[in-house]
């Protein structure tokens, strides 16, 4: 004979010795019907705040308050947001490795410094874990056939450099 607890809906509990579906008491939930007990609702307070409230059929979901981020499955811990020069990993905030940077507060990943030489430019300012490299103007390499003429432009004292 099928136990009548099997017909119980989520949001209820049922004991085998008295197979009657009963509503979960306040601050408890059951996402599966027919269980002998309802689960105690999660509470989101302190560094946590509610992303979802607990109902009779689902648990509360928490997130971290501003300036903090979640760690662990279902946001079990809150950790202070990463500073510029760091990135968030599974182990928490880690300093950017040499040659990478992150200029964002709380978010973002460490990105490689710009390679100035790819654009034919020199490094004007070296990068840090928080700031990218600053590239200088393009390096003009003069070949033997290059001629330079300075021509007046736009009135007295105005000159422009023309690379021919």
């Amino acid at each position: 004979v099928q136990n009548s607890c099997d017909n119980c809906q989520p949001g209820t509990f049922c004991r085998k010795y008295n197979p009657v579906c009963k509503s979960c008491p306040p601050s408890t939930f059951s996402s599966i019907g027919g269980q002998p007990n309802c689960n105690i609702c999660r509470v989101c307070a302190g560094y946590f705040r509610f992303k979802k409230f607990c109902s009779s059929t689902h648990n509360a979901e928490c997130e971290c308050i501003e300036g903090f981020h979640c760690l662990g499955p279902q946001c079990t811990r809150c950790e202070k947001d990463c500073r510029p020069g760091q990135e968030l990993t599974k182990q928490g905030c880690k300093t950017c490795s040499l040659g990478t940077f992150n200029d964002q507060n709380g978010t973002g990943v460490c990105r490689p410094w710009t390679n100035c030489s790819l654009d034919g430019r020199s490094v004007l300012k070296t990068g840090t874990t928080e700031k990218d490299v600053v590239c200088g103007p393009p390096v003009v390499s003069f070949s033997p056939s290059t001629t330079i003429s300075v021509t007046p432009e736009g009135g007295p004292g105005g000159h422009s450099l023309q690379v021919l």
């Epitope: 509470v43 307070a45 979802k52």
Partner: antibody
Framework: QVQLKCAGPGLVQPTQTLSLTCTVS????????VHWIRQPPGKGLEWMGI????????YFLSAIKSRLSISRDTSKSQVFLKINSLQTDDTAMYYC???????WGQGVMVTVSS | DIVLTQSPTTIAASPGEKVTITCRAS?????MYWYQQKSGASPKLWIY???KLASGVPNRFSGSGSGTSYSLAINTMETEDAATYYC?????????FGSGTKLEIK
């Protein structure tokens, strides 16, 4: 900055459907839920329900639940409240609020009368 | 549903006086939340997580309690504190409010 603006008709006839809109700015509906709360004239606050960041909803488990629906349009940053088969005791100030109740709309007064 | 019973319904206090409003829950809740509402205005979150003051709330206000018994206190009443105060629980839906306490100036 965070703002919620409620809009809807001031006067609705009994048995008709009430449609209210809450337009939010300063936060995303895909990150934060929005509540609807109402307050009959001279009375207390009654929580009606919430639409969550993922579109899921929770409603007040009372007689009104069967007449109530909350939905949203994330592209327009709007949350909607619909109540059908309106009764005179649905006359109230209707508010929307962000999930943490830290920001509330200015409210819209709805009178149900023929 | 968790029923919240506030007392008193109305209270009149003179400036400088200490005021206490209580909120009793029909079953245990983890934290209590309080709102202030002035006539013709939207409610404002006043106290959260039982005892934390919301942004801009003067520190003459305090909140305390646990289980089924909670309270909001004003150390020294000021005229601007005249308003209606509501308690609310977030432990489980439906989220319920107390019926309100109207605080008037004597």
């Amino acid at each position: 900055q965070v703002q919620l603006k409620c809009a809807g008709p001031g006067l609705v006839q009994p048995t008709q459907t009430l449609s209210l809109t809450c337009t939010v700015s300063g936060f995303s509906l895909t990150s934060d839920g929005v509540h609807w709360i109402r307050q009959p004239p001279g009375k207390g606050l009654e929580w009606m329900g919430i639409i969550y960041y993922d579109g899921g909803t929770d409603y007040f488990l009372s007689a009104i639940k069967s007449r109530l629906s909350i939905s949203r349009d994330t592209s327009k940053s709007q949350v909607f409240l619909k109540i059908n088969s309106l009764q005179t005791d649905d006359t109230a100030m209707y508010y929307c609020a962000r999930i943490h109740f830290d920001y509330w709309g200015q409210g819209v007064m709805v009178t149900v009368s023929s | 549903d968790i029923v919240l019973t506030q007392s008193p319904t109305t209270i009149a206090a003179s400036p400088g006086e200490k005021v206490t409003i209580t909120c009793r829950a029909s079953s245990s809740v983890s934290y209590m939340y309080w709102y202030q509402q002035k006539s013709g205005a939207s409610p404002k979150l006043w106290i959260y997580d039982t005892s934390k003051l919301a942004s801009g709330v003067p520190n003459r206000f305090s909140g305390s309690g646990s289980g089924t018994s909670y309270s909001l206190a004003i150390n020294t009443m000021e005229t601007e504190d005249a308003a209606t105060y509501y308690c609310q629980q977030w432990s489980s839906t439906p989220l319920t409010f107390g019926s309100g306490t109207k605080l008037e100036i004597k």
